[in-house]
């Protein structure tokens, strides 16, 4: 139940993580203007990593996308780059997770198979949380870098009358909701990994390979946490085929990657 | 079309107050700013401030503000300016005019005359 | 606050001849952003309200006739009458359209000579 749960949870926190990334993604507040010089501008500026909003005081918002590729600065590539990257491993380790919940049931799938299912989901939402928090967090530094290349700027060459205002720019929404989304969708991620580790049946903590006795029909079993308990009752290969719903002290004689000896 | 049509002249004595209309038809009231600008007599124009009816947000010139009051009836698609504590200075014409792209004025009304005397 | 400062204040020309009426901000009313000038030209003719004529620095309103122009740009904006008319009589006002309080020039007179 506690497995069921946890991978349940893990999926709806990468869910909602990786809505939070593409919506990070899709959002023209990345960078807004700095109003600390000039709180009173009629003219608001903000960006996005797609194009580049001027809003009015008189309501009236323009945007213009970035038709160019080549000449956008290499940051802003890199930053999309890992968004995307992070879209699509999130959308790929949703798809993944999908038929990994132990909830849902498709056909007579193992629970070896979902457990390899969830832990692949779990690593594609870990990785895909990075790539939007080192995509972010790559802005934010740009960000950081500019305004105070824009602030030396400022305050040289005010030595005439004519005092010209340069527009500086802060963090937008966009980098808080993609820090959130990150951290949720790797979040979500560890749920998954360690959902897995109980995804496999309880046996494969301590049996990796049952051990027959030449002439005997008794199978060799090596002591651990389960044996100690009085429970060991099931001492026959017996392997249970109920479409993959198995209880917790049912053998799996099969070897497996995440048999943990 | 759009038309701004302002409340008639005013004759006010000092320290009294006075209460402005402006008349919005042709266009959705609630989703512009409602300007208002002074011009005194032989002068140029002031900027006195700004009204959104939609929420009730204003924003005042300095030089006004304390004294000036904007409000806006959505219902009736009309926005009010009102002058308190009224002095000689105060006498002027009052517009009122639209708040468009670009940050202009692009429909005004025909002007209020306002006259503080003793 | 910005400062507008028109020039001159009254300017005389002939019929069919141009007239040129400067405005200089005290601060840049250039936006980065989309790379446009928050300067705006009003005409004010007598007993009338002022009427839009350019915005954006050099945007014709609809229905301006195209003998009126806007140049500059930062804080040295012109406004240009190619062939002056009759009815072009007026007095010419600049506006600050980048910065609270929206200001505005002292006004330029334009006379036929």
């Known amino acids: 139940m506690a497995v069921t749960a946890c991978q349940g949870l893990g999926f709806v926190v990468s869910l909602i993580g990786i809505a939070g990334i593409i919506a990070a993604t899709c959002m023209d507040q990345w960078s807004t203007q700095d109003l600390y010089n000039n709180p009173v501008t009629a003219v608001f500026n903000y960006q996005g990593l797609w194009r580049s909003c001027v809003r009015e005081s008189s309501g009236f918002t323009e945007c213009r996308g970035y038709f160019t590729l080549l000449g956008l600065p290499a940051m802003l590539q890199a930053v999309r780059a890992l968004m995307i990257v992070g879209i699509v491993l999130g959308a790929i380790g949703l798809l993944v997770s999908i038929f990994a919940l132990k909830c849902i049931r498709i056909g007579s799938m193992e629970d070896s198979a979902k457990a390899n299912m969830t832990l692949t989901s779990g690593i594609m939402f870990i990785v895909s949380g990075l790539c939007a928090i080192a995509g972010v967090s790559v802005f934010a530094n740009m960000l950081v870098t500019n305004f105070w290349m824009s602030t030396a700027n400022m305050y040289t060459g005010m030595g005439g009358m004519v005092q010209t205002v340069q527009t500086r720019y802060t963090f937008g929404a966009a980098l808080f909701v993609g820090w959130v989304a990150g951290g949720l969708t790797l979040i979500g991620g560890v749920m998954m990994c360690i959902a897995c580790r109980g995804l496999a049946p309880e046996e494969t903590n301590y049996k990796a390979v049952s051990y027959h006795a030449s002439g005997h029909s008794v199978a060799y079993k090596p002591g651990g946490f389960k044996a100690s308990t009085g429970f060991g009752s099931n001492t026959k290969n017996k392997k249970i085929y109920d479409g993959g719903a198995r209880t917790e002290d049912e053998v799996q004689s099969y070897p497996s990657k995440h048999d943990y000896v | 079309q759009v038309q701004l049509v302002q409340s008639g002249a005013e004759v006010k004595k000092p320290g009294a107050s006075v209460k402005v209309s402006c008349k919005a038809s042709?266009?959705?009231?609630?989703?512009?700013?409602m300007n208002w600008v002074k011009q005194a007599p032989g002068q140029g124009l002031e900027w006195i401030g700004q009204?959104?009816?939609?929420?009730?947000?204003?924003k005042y010139n300095g030089n006004f503000k304390g004294r000036v009051t904007l409000t806006a009836d959505t219902s009736a698609s009309t926005a009010y300016m009102e002058l308190s504590s009224l002095r000689s200075e105060d006498t002027a014409v009052y517009f009122c005019?639209?708040?468009?792209?670009?940050?202009?004025?692009?429909?005004w009304g025909q002007g209020t005359l306002v006259t503080v005397s003793s | 606050d910005i400062v507008m400062t028109q020039s001159p204040d009254s300017l005389a020309v002939s019929l069919g001849e141009r007239a040129t009426i400067n405005c200089k901000s005290s601060?840049?009313?250039?936006?980065?952003?989309?790379?446009?000038?928050?300067l705006t030209w009003y005409q004010q003719k007598p007993g009338q309200p002022p009427k839009l004529l350019i915005y954006?620095?050099?945007t014709r309103d609809s229905g301006v006739p195209d003998r009126f122009s806007g140049s500059g740009s930062g804080t040295d904006f012109t406004l240009t009458i190619s062939s002056l008319q009759a009815e072009d009589v007026a007095v010419y006002y600049c506006?600050?359209?980048?910065?609270?309080?929206?200001?505005f020039g002292g006004g330029t007179k334009v006379e036929i000579k």
């Open positions: 954006w620095a050099s």
């Open positions: 005019a639209r708040y468009y792209r670009g940050n202009c004025f692009d429909y």
């Open positions: 601060q840049s009313l250039l936006n980065s952003g989309n790379q446009k000038n928050y």
């Open positions: 506006q600050n359209a980048y910065t609270y309080p929206l200001t």
């Open positions: 009204i959104y009816p939609g929420n009730g947000d204003t």
């Open positions: 042709g266009y959705a009231f609630s989703n512009y700013w």
